[in-house]
């Protein structure tokens, strides 16, 4: 596959991944109440996200509300907010870096420097995927740990929400897309990080006697 095709495919995957990450960040479905206790008088589902939580009553009536205060949130939600937003912003920066290094743009003159810019964009997307993966896995670990913790009351047990799965899919796309962008940059000029301009010196003129300098012979 040509480097341009790798570049386009990589960028498309990264853009879809970025969109997925924004969706995961905004959705109030990072954790969803687990139905384990059939004795609960009124069945209701609680969804919790990074910015708000929603309650769906048995009647189907749903109410969502943004959290009252950042302080009222647990440390892991605060950390997840910070890391996810950082990943979204980093992906935005990576987009401009990738476009600047793309073969179809003229922001940077074609050559090794342009390939290095494209490679940087790919690496940024890879890092962006890893950055987003941290809160997703940390959050999932807490939810699963509390689910199996016998000291946690049944009414407080949660299951993994749809936003986590969307987030994981998004990080996979960002990382695969980042790898493809790196590969595209690599193929483009052949190891752009190693391609430095080589200086060739002109052959030396013969001396007055017509002899060549001994240093010119190996």
């Amino acid at each position: 596959m040509g480097s341009a095709a790798l570049e386009i495919l990589g960028l498309v995957l990264c853009l879809v991944g970025w969109g997925g990450l924004i969706l995961a960040c905004g959705l109030p479905m990072w954790q969803v109440t687990a139905f384990l206790d059939h004795n609960i008088v009124t069945a209701q589902t609680t969804w919790k996200g990074l910015w708000m939580s929603c309650v769906v009553q048995s009647t189907g009536h749903m109410q969502c509300k943004v959290y009252d205060s950042v302080l009222a949130l647990s440390t892991e939600v605060q950390a997840a907010r910070a890391l996810t937003v950082s990943a979204v912003l980093l992906a935005f920066v990576a987009l401009f870096v990738t476009l600047a290094g793309a073969q179809c743009t003229t922001c940077v003159a074609p050559g090794p420097a342009k390939a290095r810019v494209a490679l940087t964009g790919g690496v940024l997307y890879l890092f962006c995927g890893l950055l987003a993966l941290v809160p997703l896995c940390w959050f999932a670990n807490i939810v699963v740990r509390e689910f199996y913790d016998p000291s946690v009351p049944v009414s407080q047990k949660y299951e993994l929400g749809a936003a986590l799965y969307i987030g994981w899919a998004a990080t996979a796309l960002l990382m695969v897309g980042g790898c493809l962008l790196c590969c595209g940059a690599w193929v483009c000029t052949g190891r752009p990080d190693l391609s430095f301009p080589v200086k060739y010196s002109a052959p030396r003129r013969p001396t007055a006697t017509g002899d060549y300098d001994k240093k010119n012979y190996v």
Partner: antibody
């Protein structure tokens, strides 16, 4: 089961300080905040302050100068201290878990009846 | 501070009746209102938050409604165990403030 058990003196001398310990079970102080509310016949329910899961504290301005709330996550304990008590501080003092993300005390402790005399 | 006013200190009712307890905030609290029930010698228990969302395990005969400054707790069919003190609370801003309470008693 979510529980908040309180321990503290029933009788306090005027101008002395009040210390109450709230020991929680069924949830972690790393994940939930703990509110302090008092109830007196004259003034009804009064919110005093909250110790958030992250460690920061919010106080009711009317009590800020003489109130201190701290916690020990490892021991699942929250400590309440109020200085310079007067007769009108006679009340039942409650600790209550905060609803995750909101200024709503959802599960209340047993309460500590305090008489200033 | 936001003042929460419960106009009725006492409300008389009979088992099976529908009863509504009202609460008025001194300013718009945009549905950030909670309702508590307190039985004699017990701690308050949360019934409703966000003005209309029932807390886990609360029977569906308890419903909350309202917006802006006016809020209502309705018990569709009063049971003997519902005879208690009811408090409203705003969770719009700190300091959190409570109403003076409404005591529900048998007629």
């Amino acid at each position: 089961q979510v529980q908040l058990k309180q321990s503290g003196p029933g009788l306090v001398q005027p101008s002395q300080s009040l210390s109450i310990t709230c020991t929680v079970s069924g949830f972690s102080l790393i994940r939930y905040g703990v509110h302090w509310v008092r109830q007196s016949p004259g003034k009804g329910l009064e919110w005093l302050g909250v110790k958030w899961s992250g460690g920061s504290t919010d106080y009711n301005g009317a009590f800020k100068s003489r109130l201190s709330i701290s916690k020990d996550n490892s021991k699942s304990q929250v400590f309440f201290k109020m200085n310079s008590l007067q007769a009108d501080d006679t009340a039942i003092y409650y600790c209550a878990r905060g609803l995750d993300g909101y200024y709503v005390p959802d599960v209340w402790g047993t309460g500590t009846s305090v008489t200033v005399s | 501070d936001i003042v929460m006013t419960q106009s009725h200190k006492f409300m008389s009712t009979s088992v099976g009746d529908r009863v509504s307890i009202t609460c008025k905030a001194s300013q718009d609290v945009s549905t950030n209102v909670a309702w508590y029930q307190q039985k004699p010698g017990q701690s308050p228990t949360l019934l409703i938050y966000w003005a209309s969302t029932r807390h886990t395990g609360v029977p569906d005969r308890f419903t909350g409604s309202g917006s802006g400054t006016d809020y209502t707790l309705t018990i569709s069919s009063v049971q003997a165990e519902d005879l208690a003190l009811y408090y409203c609370q705003q969770h719009y801003s700190t300091p959190l403030t409570f109403g003076a309470g409404t005591k529900l008693e048998l007629r």
